[in-house]
């Protein structure tokens, strides 16, 4: 059933998530910003070929719109999206030695908000009796396509972040 | 109640190998990254890395790359961590603990294992 | 890495003082920073998460404060059980890295 602004979530939850997305768009901007200067890989819209030969996924947020939110769908939905992310991130390990400490913060992060919707989803009893199972995630063949796979991944997970902040931000509104 | 409970005390030779292991029980097991630390009397508290229990996914600290493994074994909710090629700087108390330190902070540690490396 | 500096390194003082622990990052760190208490044969504890909410159990005595760089852990009032090392650790980025610990002694 859609529920309104006026939901059962605490405000502390939304206001942690908030801080959490926020640190998560630093994370990924640093990413971004050291693929750019190292790789001169600056555009991701020159790669979304690449992305689809690679099989890079998107996580839907089909169920979060503000004007029919399905809580439970939702979170659902924000934790699986970020688990998918937990995954493509574990697969560009190795991209560089110089993007290794910026990568390992990111992939804390993701973990760290996943584990936050998690608690919440157990807490209103929404929690799913089955985790969900990491897919098929994209092999990289070369360096270069792992570099790239980074600038579409790190692009994919600030456009989820986006919607994600957007849809949190409404849910903490009085 | 949430805890984790390490193993036993072990000495070890220098250039050997030691494996700690940490049980989880009290909460959902996959839902949480495990890390592993050590206090050493020079060095203070140290992280060492962490383990995702649900992919498995590691990252560790650039000190100890190379030479620690973590892994975890799911169905018994047990995580593990192997120290190679030790060396007398690595006599410590290894602890593992709840979290990544970041948003999700050490919040439920283990008991701590004694790691003594001496010829 | 980020650098946590703590200080002072010990301190002595008697039950009921008010003492302050501080902390200082070689980088900002926003809020991340946790405080951890530890007594010889335990496993260390956390007292403080996000610079300045109190885990759960820990007396109200305990408060933290600050955000950036520079970050505190305050006893209001020192009790016999608060006399242990207290450990600041940055949770900003990876490698997550420690204060070298504070001692607070019996005077």
């Known amino acids: 059933t859609p529920l309104g602004p006026a939901s059962s979530l605490p405000q502390s939850f939304l206001l942690k998530c908030l801080e959490q997305v926020r640190k998560i768009q630093g994370d990924g901007a640093a990413l971004q910003e050291k693929l750019c200067a190292t790789y001169k890989l600056c555009h991701p819209e020159e790669l979304v070929l690449l992305g689809h030969s690679l099989g890079i996924p998107w996580a839907p947020l089909s169920s979060c719109p503000s004007q029919a939110l399905q809580l439970a769908g939702c979170l659902s939905q924000l934790h699986s999206g970020l688990f998918l992310y937990q995954g493509l991130l574990q697969a560009l390990e190795g991209i560089s030695p110089e993007l290794g400490p910026t990568l390992d913060t990111l992939q804390l992060d993701v973990a760290d908000f996943a584990t936050t919707i998690w608690q919440q989803m157990e807490e209103l009893g929404m929690a799913p009796a089955l985790q969900p199972t990491q897919g098929a995630m994209p092999a990289f063949a070369s360096a270069f396509q792992r570099r790239a796979g980074g600038v579409l991944v790190a692009s994919h997970l600030q456009s989820f972040l986006e919607v994600s902040y957007r849809v949190l931000r409404h849910l903490a509104q009085p | 109640e949430m805890q984790l409970v390490q193993s036993g005390a072990e000495a070890r030779k220098p250039g050997s190998s030691v494996k700690v292991s940490c049980k989880a029980s009290?909460?959902?097991?996959?839902?949480?990254?495990i890390s592993w630390l050590r206090q050493t009397p020079g060095q203070g508290l140290e992280w060492m890395g962490w383990i995702n229990p649900n992919s498995g996914g590691t990252i560790y600290a650039q000190k100890f790359q190379g030479r620690v493994t973590m892994t975890r074994d799911t169905p018994i909710t047990t995580a593990y961590m192997e120290l190679s090629t030790l060396r007398s700087e690595d006599t410590a108390v290894y602890y593992c603990?709840?979290?990544?330190?970041?948003?999700?902070?050490?919040?439920?540690w283990g008991q701590g294992t004694m790691v003594t490396v001496s010829s | 890495d980020i650098q946590m500096t703590q200080s002072p390194f010990s301190l002595s003082a008697s039950v009921g003082d008010r003492v302050t622990i501080t902390c200082r990052a070689s980088q900002t760190i926003s809020n991340r920073l946790n405080w951890y208490q530890h007594k010889p044969g335990k496993a260390p504890k956390l007292f403080i998460y996000?610079?300045?909410s109190l885990q759960s159990g820990v007396p109200s005595r305990f408060s933290g404060s600050g955000s950036g760089t520079d970050f505190a852990l305050t006893i209001s009032s020192l009790q016999p059980e608060d006399f242990a090392t207290y450990y600041c650790q940055q949770g900003y980025s990876s490698p997550r890295t420690f204060g070298q610990g504070t001692k607070v002694e019996i005077k």
């Open positions: 996000y610079a300045s």
């Open positions: 603990s709840r979290g990544s330190g970041g948003a999700v902070p050490f919040d439920v």
């Open positions: 009290g909460y959902t097991f996959t839902n949480y990254g």
